[in-house]
């Protein structure tokens, strides 16, 4: 996260790491004690995954093996659409107050409306920073309308746009997959965006989740 | 394979303005900045300027401001540089070459490999 | 803005020779972004050298590039004959810059 803070602790229960060894990979957001939700571009073969702790690599943290994920059917390598993904926990999560489920949308949110973006990605761009503190940015959905005069046929139509407007804030390398959370739900998915990051009036793009809420739940369902 | 092929030679009169194409092929497009660079006959290497195909902002050398109007068009993997008011001092080669990245994705820092893809070159002649 | 020099302009030497070429930045460059290339007579440039020392894809092992900060080589352990050639420092951070040129001739 380029030009954010540090999310005030515990406010994220949502919010894993997935990590490859050691090391930050991505973000994902958990959505059922057996299910992570995040960018379909983050796909290895296995994961490490993180929950209950805004630090990374906190050894007092729930790490749990996951070895089966599930990337959306569409999901181009070349133009990034559909870039969603659920991985599949090899035991479910211990529940607490530092561990919860997000809340999945039940409909759209228009553009305006004020969201909170967080992650573990580099905080400098192009030479990489990466913080071991959970970091957040708040952001404001853009209409696909404004989005579509910086990235012309390159944004989708399941793509979200979030900024502010002459700010550098912004996500980045490493906070992939994480979640933009609007209202209390889940609104998107970090997808990509310009490089170096944090280029003012160049938005963040998401997946946007409320168009794949049927997706998702299918795919839980088929795989339990 | 990946390429960057550029328009034909050019014969201008001084004051009017040029417009050289490069169309890019065997790669992503909007992944990776688009630089232009011009080579005076005899001289060495003049960077002029650049533009991220994403979203289409620019970076100009300050000698070439007011003067330089670097574009993309995304639909058709094409960049372009136009050089208006031309003088006898801007007959050159006109090259593109290809930059660093202009979109991150993954979980990764990336490491910028160099100007590792050339156009051929295009001759601009100004002359009266 | 940074300014390359390279040194020496031009550079007379025997093929099976080893040449040395210099470039000294006005102010210090991250070694990330200092790149050389090679130009021959009506050819675009090609890249040899990236990250000062990271050969480019299909270079000979012949080409090596070190230095950090403000002074960097390019060093041609034993020229051959598609060697002679203008080679050019550049650095990258993210307005390029490019230094004057070295032509290696044949002596």
């Known amino acids: 996260i380029i030009d954010g803070y540090k999310c005030k602790e515990g406010s994220h229960p949502w919010q894993v790491a997935l990590l490859k060894g050691n090391q930050l990979h991505c973000g994902g957001v958990l959505v059922d004690k057996y299910w992570v939700l995040t960018a379909a571009h983050c796909k290895m073969g296995q994961y490490q995954v993180q929950l209950g702790s805004d630090k990374i690599g906190d050894q007092s943290a729930q790490k749990i093996k996951a070895t089966k994920s599930f990337r959306h059917p569409g999901y181009s390598t070349k133009t990034h659409v559909n870039d969603i993904m659920l991985v599949r926990l090899d035991e479910p999560v211990k529940m607490s107050s530092k561990v919860e489920a997000v809340q999945l949308p039940e409909h759209c949110e228009p553009p305006g409306t004020s969201c909170t973006v967080s992650g573990w990605g580099t905080t400098t761009s192009p030479d990489v920073t990466f913080p071991s503190d959970l970091m957040c940015s708040d952001v404001k959905l853009i209409s696909s309308r404004e989005c579509k005069k910086v990235y012309k046929d390159l944004l989708g139509k399941t793509m979200l746009c979030a900024g502010i407007p002459d700010s550098k804030t912004n996500t980045c390398n490493g906070d992939s997959g994480g979640p933009l959370v609007c209202n209390d739900t889940l609104q998107g998915l970090v997808s990509w965006g310009t490089y170096p990051c944090g280029q003012p009036n160049d938005p963040g793009v998401y997946t946007q989740v409320c168009k794949y809420k049927r997706w998702v739940m299918e795919t839980m369902k088929t795989h339990r | 394979q990946v390429q960057l092929v550029q328009s034909g030679a050019e014969v201008k009169k001084p004051g009017a303005s040029v417009k050289v194409s490069c169309k890019a092929s065997?790669?992503?497009?909007?992944?990776?900045?688009m630089h232009w660079v011009r080579q005076a006959p005899g001289q060495g290497l003049e960077w002029m300027g650049s533009?991220?195909?994403?979203?289409?902002?620019?970076n100009y050398a300050q000698k070439f401001q007011g003067r330089v109007t670097m574009t993309r068009d995304t639909s058709i993997s094409t960049a372009y540089m136009e050089l208006s008011r031309l003088r006898s001092d801007d007959t050159a080669v006109y090259y593109c070459?290809?930059?660093?990245?202009?979109?991150?994705?993954?979980?990764?820092?990336?490491?910028?490999?160099?100007?590792?893809?050339w156009g051929q070159g295009t001759t601009v002649t100004v002359s009266s | 803005e940074i300014v390359l020099t390279q040194s020496p302009g031009t550079l007379s030497l025997s093929p099976g020779e080893r040449a040395t070429l210099s470039c000294r930045a006005s102010?210090?460059?991250?070694?990330?972004?200092l790149a050389w290339y090679q130009q021959k007579p009506g050819q675009a440039p090609r890249l040899l050298i990236y990250?000062?020392?990271s050969r480019a894809t299909g270079i000979p092992d012949r080409f090596s590039g070190s230095g950090s900060g403000t002074d960097f080589t390019l060093t041609i352990s034993r020229l051959e004959p598609e060697d002679f050639a203008v080679y050019y420092c550049?650095?990258?951070?993210?307005?390029?810059?490019f230094g004057g040129g070295t032509k290696v001739e044949i002596k």
């Open positions: 533009i991220n195909p994403t979203s289409g902002r620019t």
């Open positions: 102010q210090s460059v991250s070694s990330d972004y």
């Open positions: 550049q650095q990258y951070a993210p307005l390029w810059t």
């Open positions: 065997g790669y992503t497009f909007a992944g990776y900045d």
């Open positions: 990250g000062a020392s």
């Open positions: 070459a290809r930059g660093g990245p202009s979109t991150w994705y993954g979980g990764s820092a990336y490491t910028y490999y160099g100007a590792d893809v």
